[in-house]
Interface confidence: medium
């Protein structure tokens, strides 16, 4: 008998539905044992720009320990403001500086993403380290990302269509799910149905959703049914706010008392099936039905309270954003830049506009120095030695001051260009951990020291080493001792900073082959950036230190085989 | 560090005035908007007015307006409320309160009571 | 001008979650703040732009916001945590302030 009840749209205020899945539409997991470095590739598509994106990187530990360097490529479509989380994760991070804003200052290594296409991204990043996971993922509000996690039965990943990510990835949509809703003809009463369909997906075993339901209405106010359908291994895990009767396949089990499992019934697999059960359990009104793909937790908010059923013409669109302006987001787009003995500062206005903000002034610290309008943008421009700029040794500082039209008080951000004609960087190399007793030979075989220090100190910004080689001459070859921030091979260990935060590192090294190079060439490539703020005001530098070879040792790492 | 220290509070009759202080320290007093806020006996909060950073823009809650006038003085580093036509639902701690994006400081504190 | 609705009052025991909610209608479009305020004492921030925490705020301080609702979220309350809970927002369109009418934390 077909049930004749019209699904039709539901605004957000009577019903939204978000998800987590662990559904990709492409997506590998494979496993990596014995890597140093675990790479993971993120492919983000974002269908308009600006976007707010939170990704958080969870580790479990091994041994106690978390043993592995991670690489995260991160390859966006459009301009997003990432919050990202990775505490303790010795994380490097590769991305577009152009696209991606940071919400905060990561804290992370970083490399810039080459603009290529998504297979020869994959390439880049296998080059550094076998995949243990990529994903492609269609406008995520969140990501979590589980290291050390990785299942996959594969050795090698390559991006298939349709993957469940299993326990390694796990994300949310920014769009909810589309919520429908009727009124099942010839049934009386205010009784409703909330039904949820769990689409089958790739899972690899028994898999438990986790249902949050939050109906606002007062207790007494609602008689409704919770219908929940899945596929066999699917059970579910109940946090409601409201008691009402539960009709579910498989198991499931409320969450103040999770260990009692009650068993379900055999439900239809059909829309229209489940729209019966529903009216056979005397429900009036369908206030809500969504269908999703497996998920881990989904969340229902509705208002219905079997009251009049609201439903929209249109299809839910995405939650709109806050319509109030974050100054703290605001001044975090701010991007600096330093050249010709001047200070800029660039305000892109779509990003300003996205976030709802209205900009009734951007100044120096002298407010007589105001930025001009150039159409798309903010440009505020100032020579160092004018507008309040503080000049020390190694850093010009001004604070960048914006007017917002609904905030009493002006946001302010410190803002900074370093000296570089006072700047010297210097390599140093030491024969034992203190770094006390600086040499200018190495011996192969016994372990050598490095240090890279910057004078004058320059407090707010890190110094980085990026990569570093030996260049020993057309007899010895080059020698890879850093590369993209990360140690090459077993022979290089990256070491804790000088308590002044200068970059160190050791490395051994043996030769195989006569005759041996008398001298060599250390030159590292350093980098200055910004602990705060834009990738913009980067600055490199190539350190170069020359140094002698002495006496022979036949055995270990070579320099060339 | 921030500091907020409200006064002239005390016991006053319906329909008299009174005039509340607010003398800040610790941070460029002139750079921050600021807002009075209120809380009545075992009640809860209740915003009063603000003031822009340079005194350009005022706004009140409808309960106080045309009744009371937030100022301040940059030079002095105060803030006030002139209170006029006091009413028995004006009892309340009064608190000043520096205004920011990421937040409110607020001050102690300083008792009203209207009272015949 | 819109309104913040809040609990009169929530109950936990030490090292349960609490959960203490501010729903309005303009919530969806609007930030939400709250403060904490202990007997005698002038209010803390302790989540500011629905799920901001300042600086000096213990981690288990959370808050989100969904629709309508604003949630501020004690993982692990703590009788220290016993307090008034007061969420607001700020009306831009009229440069109004408006207040929850504040919720009584009882970790017991």
């Known amino acids: 008998e077909t049930v004749h009840c019209d699904l039709q749209p539901v605004g957000p205020e009577r019903g939204e539905v978000t998800y987590t899945t662990s559904q990709v539409s492409k997506g590998c997991v494979a496993q990596a044992p014995n890597a140093i470095l675990e790479v993971h590739v993120l492919f983000l598509e974002f269908p308009t720009g600006p976007s707010q994106l939170e990704l958080t990187l969870q580790a479990s530990k091994q041994n106690g320990t978390w043993p592995r360097e991670v690489l995260l490529v991160l390859s966006v479509n459009s301009s997003v403001f990432l919050h990202l989380q990775a505490l303790g994760i010795p994380l490097h991070l590769a991305y577009n500086s152009s696209l991606v804003t940071f919400q905060e200052p990561p804290g992370v290594n970083t490399t810039e993403l080459p603009s290529f296409p998504k297979t020869q991204i994959l390439e880049w990043a296998a080059e550094r380290g076998p995949i243990t996971s990529a994903a492609e993922l269609n406008d995520p509000q969140s990501i979590l990302l589980r290291l050390g996690q990785a299942q996959g039965s594969l050795s090698f990943c390559m991006l298939e269509a349709s993957q469940d990510m299993g326990r390694t990835l796990e994300w949310r949509p920014r769009t909810p799910a589309l919520v429908r809703g009727c009124h099942l003809e010839g049934v009386a009463g205010h009784k409703e149905a909330h039904i949820l369909r769990v689409l089958p997906g790739h899972s690899a075993g028994p898999r438990t959703v986790t249902v949050k339901v939050e109906l606002s209405c007062a207790p007494g106010d609602l008689d409704a049914v919770l219908i929940l359908q899945g596929p066999p291994y699917v059970s579910w895990l109940i946090d409601a706010n409201h008691n009402m009767q539960i009709w579910t396949t498989g198991e499931y089990s409320f969450k103040i008392f999770p260990e009692k499992n009650i068993r379900g019934f055999k439900l239809p697999d059909t829309p229209q099936g489940l729209l019966g059960e529903a009216r056979m359990l005397n429900a009036s009104i369908v206030a809500s039905f969504v269908e999703l793909p497996l998920a881990s937790i989904v969340s229902l908010h509705a208002s219905s309270c079997g009251g009049r059923l609201q439903t929209s013409p249109a299809p839910i669109q995405t939650t709109p954003p806050k319509d109030t302006c974050s100054p703290e987001l605001l001044m975090s787009l701010i991007q600096t830049k330093c050249a010709d003995d001047a200070m800029t500062l660039v305000l892109k206005k779509e990003l300003v506009a996205h976030l709802k903000c209205t900009i009734t002034g951007l100044t120096f610290w002298d407010p007589s120095c105001e930025a001009e309008d150039r159409g798309d943008k903010f440009v505020l421009r100032s020579a160092y030695s004018s507008c309040g700029m503080q000049v020390s040794a190694s850093m010009i500082s001004n604070e960048a001051v914006v007017n917002i039209l609904s905030s009493s008080s002006p946001q302010r951000k410190k803002v900074h260009c370093l000296n570089m004609d006072s700047l010297s960087f210097q390599l140093g190399l030491y024969l034992s951990p203190h770094f006390l007793q600086a040499s200018n030979t190495i011996e192969p075989g016994q372990q050598s020291f490095v240090q890279v220090r910057v004078s004058p100190s320059v407090s707010e910004f890190l110094l980085q080493l990026d990569s570093c080689h030996l260049d020993l001459g057309p007899e010895g070859g080059t020698v890879e001792l850093i590369q993209g921030r990360a140690a090459k091979g077993n022979c290089v260990s990256l070491l804790s900073p000088s308590p002044e935060g200068d970059p160190r590192f050791s490395f051994l090294l043996h030769f195989y082959t006569v005759p041996i190079p008398k001298t060599g060439t250390l030159s590292c490539t350093v980098a200055l950036r910004p602990k705060t703020g834009s990738q913009d005001q980067e600055v490199h530098r190539t350190v170069f230190m020359r140094l002698n070879i002495i006496s022979p040792d036949l055995s270990g790492c070579t320099s060339k085989g | 560090q921030v500091q907020l220290v409200e006064s002239g509070g005390g016991v006053v009759q319906p329909g008299r005035s009174l005039r509340l202080s607010c003398a800040a320290s610790?941070?460029?007093?002139?750079?921050?908007?600021m807002h009075w806020v209120r809380q009545a006996p075992g009640k809860g909060l209740e915003w009063v007015a603000v003031i822009w950073y340079d005194g350009s823009n005022k706004y009140y809650a409808d309960s106080v307006k045309g009744r009371f006038t937030i100022s301040r003085d940059n030079s002095k580093n105060t803030l006030y409320l002139q209170m006029n036509s006091l009413r028995a639902e004006d009892t309340a701690v009064y608190y000043c309160v520096r205004d920011y994006s990421s937040g409110w400081y607020w001050g102690q504190g300083t008792l009203v009571t209207v009272s015949s | 001008s819109y309104e913040l609705t809040q609990p009169p009052s929530v109950s936990v025991s030490p090292g349960q979650t609490a959960r203490i909610t501010c729903s309005g209608d303009?919530?969806?479009?609007?930030?939400a703040y709250w403060y904490q305020q202990k007997s005698g004492q002038a209010p803390v921030l302790v989540i500011y732009e629905d799920s901001k925490r300042p600086s000096g705020i213990p981690e288990r301080f959370s808050g989100s916001s969904s629709g309508t609702m604003a949630t501020l979220t004690i993982s692990g309350a703590q009788v220290e945590d016993e307090a008034d809970y007061s969420c607001?927002?700020?009306?831009?369109?009229?440069?109004?302030?408006?207040f929850g009418g504040g919720t009584k934390l009882t970790v017991l």
């Open positions: 610790g941070f460029t007093f002139s750079s921050y908007g």
């Open positions: 303009a919530l969806p479009k609007k930030y």
């Open positions: 607001y927002s700020i009306d831009s369109s009229v440069n109004h302030v408006v």
